[in-house]
Interface confidence: low
């Protein structure tokens, strides 16, 4: 899997999970989240050569097409596969609210 | 939806469905498929600005991060959302076989 266990331990130009820490105030301008201050969101990036962690049959077709027609603009892209939620604390007035924001943390990637 | 009904009728730089016809022999080097000779595979391409058809909360976070930090390499990507199968005819020896190849045709796109 193109997850932290693999990607953070290998230098990989192809599609892989990349570390990204996001500070809610500094990076997003969000002041409404009280906790946490930020989190390890991660992101996916890298090339998608033929058969590299292809998501669907179409991805395989597109990457093969791109191999044979390298000048073409049609090529697969490295995107998130498994995501996890993040528990946040925010306020409505003086009332603290705990909520899970779904799909906030990328755990693994794929070519799609 | 970023499908043919919208994307093929509008000039759109942002993430959208793009037409792509693939000839099995010419574009993929596949000689084993007897029918069809090719098909409208389509593909997804275009920019993913903040809130443009975002797939997940992480995509929204990433596109907003990218807006505030335009020099960052972390940005969402335009990829396939809905896919459809393609029915093909091929031969094993002299015996014709009909099969459905799943996820061969892109019908709509999303930012992920």
């Amino acid at each position: 899997a193109l997850d932290a266990a693999y990607c953070f331990r290998n230098v990989q130009d192809n599609c892989c999970l990349r570390p990204l820490y996001i500070d809610f105030k500094r990076d997003l301008g969000w002041k409404w989240i009280h906790e946490p201050k930020g989190y390890n969101a991660n992101f996916c990036a890298g090339a998608c050569p033929y058969l590299w962690s292809s998501d669907t049959q179409h991805t395989k077709v597109l990457s093969l097409y791109n191999t044979i027609n390298p000048e073409a603009s049609a090529s697969p892209c490295c995107v998130s596969q498994d995501l996890e939620p993040l528990t946040i604390l925010y306020y409505i007035g003086n009332t603290p609210k705990i909520e899970q924001l779904s799909n906030m943390i990328v755990k693994s990637c794929k070519c799609s | 939806a970023l499908d043919a009904a919208y994307c093929f009728r509008n000039v759109q730089d942002n993430c959208c469905l793009r037409p792509l016809y693939i000839d099995f022999k010419r574009d993929l080097g596949w000689k084993w498929i007897h029918e069809p000779k090719g098909y409208n595979a389509n593909f997804c391409a275009g920019a993913c600005p903040y809130l443009w058809s975002s797939d997940t909360q992480h995509t929204k976070v990433l596109s907003l991060y990218n807006t505030i930090n335009p020099e960052a390499s972390a940005s969402p990507c335009c990829v396939s959302q809905d896919l459809e199968p393609l029915t093909i005819l091929y031969y094993i020896g002299n015996t014709p076989k009909i099969e459905q190849l799943s996820n061969m045709i892109v019908k709509s796109c999303k930012c992920s």
């Epitope: 820490y21 009280h34 201050k37 989190y39 603290p96 | -």
Partner: antibody, heavy 118, light 108 residues
């Protein structure tokens, strides 16, 4: 001034029930959460859980979930910590504390020493 | 379960600077709070939200956070600063967690 006054020390036998109290004064009781913290003899602080006295919403540490019950009576500005069946390992000092905003405790009670021994 | 790690004890000479650390996997993303507890007394909040000081707490007390380590700094240490110090923060489910505590000894 803000004060949290806790009930007095208790000596109990294993299997007995107990309810200790924490009375808040000098502030709007329903606008702040009340947390309970355990300190076993010679040991560190352990967060047990908290209550929103305004709406009686509670949140427990996984270590204490099902072991204790936190409640409150907003009409008398008092929070409670109770056990239905005490164990010797419940012997500890128990503090209540006011939770300001979210995660920090700005005022503490003086503590209630609970001793469970046969 | 999530843990915050503190040194068991820290010694500082009278008038010098003491630094007490608190480390945990989530600490880079969450606020840390610090409490002082003297023998036989209830804890007292000395730093909240990593670096903010409640009114009544001397300026000698300051807090910072770098990476996954929060630090409580006590400058110009006095005999009255001798106490146990606890950090507190959260796990990923926003359950509060205390560090194990650090006994500060002021020498001289």
């Amino acid at each position: 001034q803000v004060q949290l006054v806790q009930s007095g020390a208790e000596v109990k036998k294993p299997g007995e029930s107990l309810k200790i109290s924490c009375k808040g004064s000098g502030y709007s009781f329903t606008r702040y959460y009340v947390a309970w913290v355990r300190q076993m003899p010679g040991k560190g602080l352990e967060w047990m859980g908290w209550i929103d006295p305004g709406q009686s919403n509670t949140r427990y540490s996984p270590s204490f979930q099902g072991q204790v019950t936190i409640s409150a009576d907003k009409s008398i500005s008092t929070a409670y910590l109770q056990w239905s069946s005490l164990k010797a390992s419940d012997t500890a000092m128990y503090y209540c504390a006011r939770m300001l905003a979210w995660g920090w405790f700005d005022y503490w009670g003086q503590g209630t020493l609970v001793t469970v021994s046969s | 379960s999530y843990e915050l790690t503190q040194p068991l004890s820290v010694s500082v000479a009278l008038g010098q600077t003491a630094r007490i650390t608190c480390s945990g996997d989530n600490l880079g993303g969450y606020y840390a709070h610090w409490y002082q507890q003297k023998p036989g007394q209830a804890p007292v909040l000395v730093i909240y939200d990593t670096s903010d000081r409640p009114s009544g707490i001397p300026e000698r007390f300051s807090g910072s956070n770098s990476g996954n380590t929060a630090t409580l700094t006590i400058s110009r240490a006095q005999a009255g600063d001798e106490a146990d110090y606890y950090c507190a923060s959260y796990d990923s489910s926003l359950m509060m967690v205390f560090g194990g505590g650090t006994k500060l000894t002021v020498l001289g």
